[in-house]
Interface confidence: low
């Protein structure tokens, strides 16, 4: 009968040939009377057999990731008679893995958007690397993820590649971050290969800033001949948020005379001071009112950023008009 052990050949061998093992008949007494032959895919090009001894050699560098096993057939012939000594037999050569593939991130480019001020532990995105090496061969394809850039704002779960927030971020200070993640095989042991990917993390705005008046005092004038409804000037607050989070409403906080009103121009986000009642220079030639400004949309959970509305003082001088 045939005698052999299991055949393995390491991939990426740099030698010109590599001895894999021996195929022989137990009838072979070593006097070179038998001839061994190799048949099948790879016979003669990738593998050869010593026709006298049955020793098998790989004569080509192999790549397990391209092909992990070869199924071949062996024959042994009595040279004297030309007849088969054993029935033709099929056998397998397995290509064993070495750690020759670095982890690769297949879903690049990564981009994520998270609301600013998100709490610690908030999931941002999951990055996943793939390693072409054999997962059943030691740790060649066992990956660990780590953060090369992005501390202290982000963290990555070592075994899953899930990126989470580790420190609150303020969009008004920085609105995007580049996080660099490394995936290392061999669970980080010596001989490990690595791959990196970049993740662009953008912060979306939340309403964490209240509007604040640009000036603490505004000076306006109004003619005593001005009719009610006249716009006598504008006031303006600024808000570091953007979009609807920066939309604001102006209002009167204090006007004992009840002479003025403020309306909001939602296009320009300015407050327009309006004359509500006619004024008379001879009766009163100046007024002092206080205005306040608040955001239009404030979710309940963000009210803590909007506890005291910003206020400003407006001094209004009445201009005298000659009366007949």
């Amino acid at each position: 009968g045939w005698v052999w052990n299991q055949f393995f050949v390491p991939e990426e061998m740099n030698t010109t040939s590599h001895h894999i093992g021996q195929l022989r008949s137990d009838l072979d007494n070593g006097n070179n009377s038998f001839q061994y032959k190799l048949l099948g895919a790879g016979a003669g090009s990738t593998f050869i057999i010593d026709e006298r001894t049955g020793d098998i050699y790989a004569i080509q560098k192999l790549d397990r990731e391209e092909r992990s096993l070869y199924i071949l057939r062996a024959q042994v012939i009595d040279i004297a008679t030309g007849r088969a000594v054993e029935p033709e037999s099929e056998f397998v050569i397995k290509v064993s893995d070495i750690n020759d593939n670095e982890p690769k991130f297949l879903d690049e480019p990564y981009e994520a958007i998270v609301p600013e001020m998100s709490p610690e532990g908030t999931l941002v995105i999951q990055v996943t690397a793939s390693d072409a090496d054999d997962p059943s061969s030691g740790n060649n394809a066992r990956l660990l993820y780590s953060l090369l850039q992005g501390q202290p704002y982000f963290s990555v779960e070592p075994t899953t590649g899930v990126i989470r927030i580790s420190s609150k971020m303020d969009r008004e200070l920085q609105d995007e971050y580049w996080v660099i993640i490394q995936a290392k095989d061999m669970i980080g042991q010596p001989g490990a290969l690595s791959g990196t990917t970049s993740v662009l993390i953008k912060l979306s705005d939340v309403n964490d800033n209240k509007p604040i008046f640009k000036e603490s005092l505004y000076r306006l004038t109004v003619s005593e001949s001005a009719p009610t409804g006249t716009s006598i000037g504008t006031i303006m607050a600024y808000d570091n948020d953007i979009g609807e989070n920066a939309e604001m409403d102006y209002s009167i906080e204090e006007d004992d005379s009840q002479t003025f009103d403020i309306i909001t121009n939602h296009e320009t986000q300015e407050g327009i001071v309006i004359l509500k009642k006619k004024v008379d220079f001879e009766h009163q030639n100046h007024y002092g009112i206080r205005a306040k400004v608040k955001n239009h949309h404030v979710p309940e959970q963000l009210m803590k950023y909007h506890t005291e509305a910003s206020t400003t003082f407006i001094k209004i001088q009445v201009e005298d008009v000659d009366e007949p």
């Epitope: 609301p115 941002v124 996943t128």
Partner: antibody
Framework: QVQLLESGGGLVQPGGSLRLSCAAS????????MNWVRQAPGKGLEWVST????????YYADSVKGRFTISRDNSKSTLYLQMNSLRAEDTAVYHC??????????????WGQGTTVTVSS | EIVMTQSPVTLSLSLGERATLSCRAS??????LAWFQQKPGQAPRLLIY???TRATGIPARFSGSGSGTEFTLTISSLEPEDFAVYYC?????????FGGGTKVEIK
């Protein structure tokens, strides 16, 4: 605008197979995760499976693991669900749903109208 | 598996009333919660994600709040088109899970 159109549903016997398709348009298909979610008659929503944008990651509900396979052809902007060994309890309307961005990458921001799968002898 | 529990199962309210829907997660899911609206014979529609961020085109009367395990969807003043079934869904952990739904019906 974003559109998702499911097809491939129908009546099948227990143990049979079906392949659902979801044709997507109006967005860069390969940039988004995609999901299958089902709804049995008169019941709530049940997540079935998710695949990442490049197809590297696939996730399945325990109830379908080993029987269903999610896949995608980014060149055709099409999502698939191969359903084998179908059971009566797989009877439902199957919706495909597009993933979102960022913290909502594995979310579901646009849904298709669904295709009906009936498993009955 | 994260279990999502919605309450109440049914909410009977009149037009213009405020609706408050609750959703509880069996363990913390941070702010990774979405709310969907579904009307009979239609596909679900995303209302809220990230616990309180309104999806594109969703009216301001819909607002979400909460984090960790307790979440709320509020409809400030019910319009005729708001009577539907509402589902919460967590996307913090695999498997993704939905709540059983809350039906908002006209009283």
């Amino acid at each position: 605008q974003v559109q998702l159109l499911e097809s491939g549903g129908g009546l099948v016997q227990p143990g049979g197979s079906l392949r659902l398709s979801c044709a997507a348009s109006g967005f860069t298909f390969s940039s988004y995760a995609m999901n299958w979610v089902r709804q049995a008659p008169g019941k709530g929503l049940e997540w079935v499976s998710t695949i990442s944008g490049g197809g590297a990651n696939t996730y399945y509900a325990d109830s379908v693991k080993g029987r269903f396979t999610i896949s995608r052809d980014n060149s055709k902007s099409t999502l698939y669900l191969q359903m084998n060994s179908l059971r009566a309890e797989d009877t439902a309307v199957y919706h495909c749903a597009k993933g979102g961005m960022g913290g909502y990458y594995y979310g579901m921001d646009v849904w298709g109208q669904g295709t009906t799968v009936t498993v009955s002898s | 598996e994260i279990v999502m529990t919605q309450s109440p199962v049914t909410l009977s309210l009149s037009l213009g009333e405020r609706a408050t829907l609750s959703c509880r997660a069996s363990q913390s899911i941070s702010s990774n919660l979405a709310w969907f609206q579904q009307k009979p014979g239609q596909a679900p529609r995303l209302l809220i994600y990230g616990a309180f961020t309104r999806a594109t085109g969703i009216p301001a009367r819909f607002s979400g709040s909460g984090s960790g395990t307790e979440f709320t969807l509020t409809i400030s003043s019910l319009e005729p088109e708001d009577f539907a079934v509402y589902y919460c869904q967590q996307y913090n952990y695999w498997p993704l899970t939905f709540g059983g739904g809350t039906k908002v019906e006209i009283k």
